[in-house]
């Protein structure tokens, strides 16, 4: 079943996907699509990489992590309720039926109306049900939400996986990771 992630209307949503290149520079094509992963390719492609660059994208979708080191996590800018649904991350490993396929469920919630700033978005206050990550500006706060049921003994090293990614400072020693490859 799909792992579920949540974001509020107007925020940026983050859908994690990683792989480990077989050797430095040995990148493989990746596609992201709206809808569950089909047998081949991605349906309704929103972003695609080749062996070197992002070579197709639609507006509001981008890779903010170090995709050339395998962090192909998708950011969706300024989400609306229509962005809810299943997304497919497909690591297109050469060879017949070698692809790694990951279905991620994005749930968009109506924006909370709050009269004044609260500690609601603070990492420690919200953990473990909600992770919030700082962006690089006031408009870029992201929510990586509703983690699958995990307990503290199961928490692994997302910060290591993210390496130079913008999330690393916030997630440090805590989080959940999808490991590919």
């Amino acid at each position: 079943s799909e792992v579920e992630y949540r974001a509020e209307v107007g925020q940026n949503a983050y859908l994690p996907c990683f792989y480990t290149p077989a050797a430095p520079g040995n990148l493989v094509p990746v596609c992201w699509g709206k809808g569950a992963c089909p047998v081949f390719e991605c349906g309704n492609v929103v972003l695609r990489t080749d062996e070197r660059d992002v070579n197709y994208w639609t507006s509001r979708y981008w890779l903010n992590g170090d995709f050339r080191k395998g962090d192909v996590s998708l950011t969706i800018e300024n989400v609306t309720l229509a962005d809810s649904g299943i997304y497919c991350c497909r690591i297109q490993i050469p060879g017949i039926m070698n692809d790694e396929k990951f279905n991620l469920k994005l749930v968009i919630k109506p924006a909370k109306v709050t009269p004044a700033p609260t500690r609601q978005r603070d990492f420690t206050a919200a953990f473990p049900r909600m992770l919030t990550t700082r962006g690089h500006g006031p408009a870029e706060t992201q929510t990586l939400g509703s983690l699958p049921d995990i307990n503290l003994t199961q928490i692994s090293t997302l910060a290591n996986e993210l390496r130079d990614s913008r999330l690393a400072n916030d997630l440090r020693d805590s989080g959940a990771t999808i490991r590919i490859g």
């Epitope: 062996e51 660059d53 800018e77």
Partner: antibody, heavy 120, light 107 residues
Framework: QVQLQQSGPERVKPGDSVKMSCKAS????????MDWVKQSHGKSLEWIGY????????SYNQKFKGKATLTVDKSSSTAYMELHSLTSEDSAVYYC?????????????WGQGTSVTVSA | SIVMTQTPKFMPVSAGDRVTMTCKAS??????VAWYQQKPGQSPKLLIY???NRYTGVPDRFTGSGSGTDFTFTISSVQVEDLAVYFC?????????FGTGTKLEIK
């Protein structure tokens, strides 16, 4: 040391084609991409495309599809770019440049440039 | 294509000045921005890649920063030999695109 030696200046007529070369030395030719960049007089840089000598794979800027053809000769470590159906808009300096994974596919070594003048 | 808007176009400087130029991408490019120096009659030279990584042999007076859509290139103390045109480049997507350049000129 790494060197990219480009062929000399070209003066051609409108409608003609021109093929320029870029001879690489000082590194393993098949381990790096070869990118090509256009610089019109006093203007910025435009990426034309790349070729990966290891497998001959190419990628082109849509703007230059049909205008430029990239090829390599692995035996002589030489990359080529042919420009077709030339017009005055194609008058520019054309650079070959090496790019590789270590620098995130930025261009760390450049040829000296080949000047192309299209004139009747 | 992603548009890289580079400012200013010209920058009058004196030796020893601290100079800063900026590049704004039309959409997020992560950290995938490079900076090049081009002197008259020469080929461009790579100075910075992946937003802030100084290329081998580049003096530490050259620094880059930024992420997402906004990037900055700084020369902490301009030397006479730094007079040149500086270009930013996004190396996130294909086609790769460059800024229009910033020309450092003597004040």
């Amino acid at each position: 040391q790494v060197q990219l030696q480009q062929s000399g200046p070209e003066r051609v007529k409108p409608g003609d084609s021109v093929k320029m070369s870029c001879k690489a030395s000082g590194y393993t030719f098949t381990d790096y991409y070869m990118d090509w960049v256009k610089q019109s007089h006093g203007k910025s840089l435009e990426w034309i495309g790349y070729i990966y000598p290891n497998n001959g794979g190419t990628s082109y800027n849509q703007k230059f599809k049909g205008k430029a053809t990239l090829t390599v000769d692995k035996s002589s470590s030489t990359a080529y770019m042919e420009l077709h159906s030339l017009t005055s808009e194609d008058s520019a300096v054309y650079y070959c440049a090496r790019s590789g994974y270590g620098n995130y596919y930025t261009m760390d070594y450049w040829g000296q440039g080949t000047s192309v003048t299209v004139s009747a | 294509s992603i548009v890289m808007t580079q400012t200013p176009k010209f920058m009058p400087v004196s030796a020893g000045d601290r100079v800063t130029m900026t590049c704004k991408a039309s959409q997020s490019v992560g950290n995938n921005v490079a900076w090049y120096q081009q002197k008259p009659g020469q080929s461009p030279k790579l100075l910075i890649y992946y937003a802030s990584n100084r290329y081998t042999g580049v003096p530490d007076r050259f620094t880059g920063s930024g992420s997402g859509t906004d990037f900055t290139f700084t020369i902490s103390s301009v030397q006479v030999e730094d007079l040149a045109v500086y270009f930013c480049q996004q190396h996130y997507s294909s086609p790769s695109t460059f800024g229009t350049g910033t020309k450092l000129e003597i004040k």
